[in-house]
């Protein structure tokens, strides 16, 4: 297993609709054809997997149908979008990239993107 540098923004504020997008960029040492991207969430020292996708270079990322993540790839960049976020989902979202094929296998883990999520203000009751 060889190490690889992964860069991602330090801080992102999700939209009022609970959507956060950020780029995860990896320094590919060779010409990988199969890449696996995993998003991990770290909060209060606990790490959980948010979503994962394996893709062939030049193809779209395919997450599971019920995944809260979508993404596109361009060269050594993956543009990740996480939706359905609420304030309780605020935390550090870490991008993990694995170059699966051809060998050698490379692994890179970013420092994480702190995603702040603000629940929208409830609309005041209106009299009709």
């Amino acid at each position: 297993c060889k190490a690889m540098h992964v860069a991602q923004p330090a801080v992102v504020l999700a939209s009022s609709r609970g959507i956060a997008s950020f780029v995860c960029e990896y320094a590919s040492p060779g010409k990988a054809t199969e890449v696996r991207v995993t998003v991990l969430r770290q909060a209060d020292s606990q790490v959980t997997e948010v979503c994962a996708a394996t893709y062939m270079m030049g193809n779209e990322l395919t997450f599971l149908d019920d995944s809260i993540c979508t993404g596109t790839s361009s060269g050594n960049q993956v543009n990740l979008t996480i939706q359905g976020l609420r304030a309780m989902d605020t935390g550090l979202y870490i991008c993990k990239v694995e170059l699966m094929y051809p060998p050698p296998y490379y692994l890179g883990i970013g420092n994480g993107t702190q995603i702040y999520v603000i629940d929208p203000e409830p609309c005041p009751d209106s009299d009709f």
Partner: antibody, heavy 117, light 108 residues
Framework: QVQLVQSGAEVKKPGASVKVSCKAS????????ISWVRQAPGQGLEWMGW????????NYAQKLQGRVTMTTDTSTNTAYMELRSLRSDDTAVYYC??????????WGQGTLVTVSS | EIVLTQSPGTLSLSPGERATLSCRAS???????LAWYQQKPGQAPRLLIY???SRATGIPDRFSGSGSGTDFTLTISRLEPEDFAVYYC?????????FGQGTKVEIK
Amino acid sequence: QVQLVQSGAEVKKPGASVKVSCKASGYTFTSYGISWVRQAPGQGLEWMGWISAYNGNTNYAQKLQGRVTMTTDTSTNTAYMELRSLRSDDTAVYYCVRVGANWFDPWGQGTLVTVSS
Amino acid sequence: EIVLTQSPGTLSLSPGERATLSCRASQSVSSSYLAWYQQKPGQAPRLLIYGASSRATGIPDRFSGSGSGTDFTLTISRLEPEDFAVYYCQQYGSSPWTFGQGTKVEIK
């Protein structure tokens, strides 16, 4: 080193607007956020809101909603805070501060805004 | 809105003594999102502690933070002359982010 440099002191009349700038250097501007905090004379710190320089999304304190606008110019690594319809109780030192993953540092030197007729 | 209440309002101590400052939250705050700042007259605040217990770069180890839930503490083990200032806690885990009203540490 990482530094935030703010614009100079301003004197404004009630009802006017003020726009304070905060120029960042020494780091990748779009990777972080900028928060604005004010401090009235002899008082404590009041959080005004913040902007994500990565995507321009903002989160404002409810009491200032509708009067405050925070923006960034990523070409010059500068953040701006505009406050409209100024009142005498808006007289304060206004600070910008970098928002990191779970820390706020460094702070700008502060900009004194005086609202007086 | 999470209200942070700092106590005492003023702490009168001598150099070399231990200072214990309290910050109590009206609702539970994730310890990842609690910070302490020091402010001297005419200066901008300076980050001391973030994540409730992590010391910021360049902060001497006489400053330490602890606590979880609704009760947090900043401890200065041995007060140096330059430590006399106002100290603020801040939570940034729940919007709106809020500050405590401050504790002034003054020379006795």
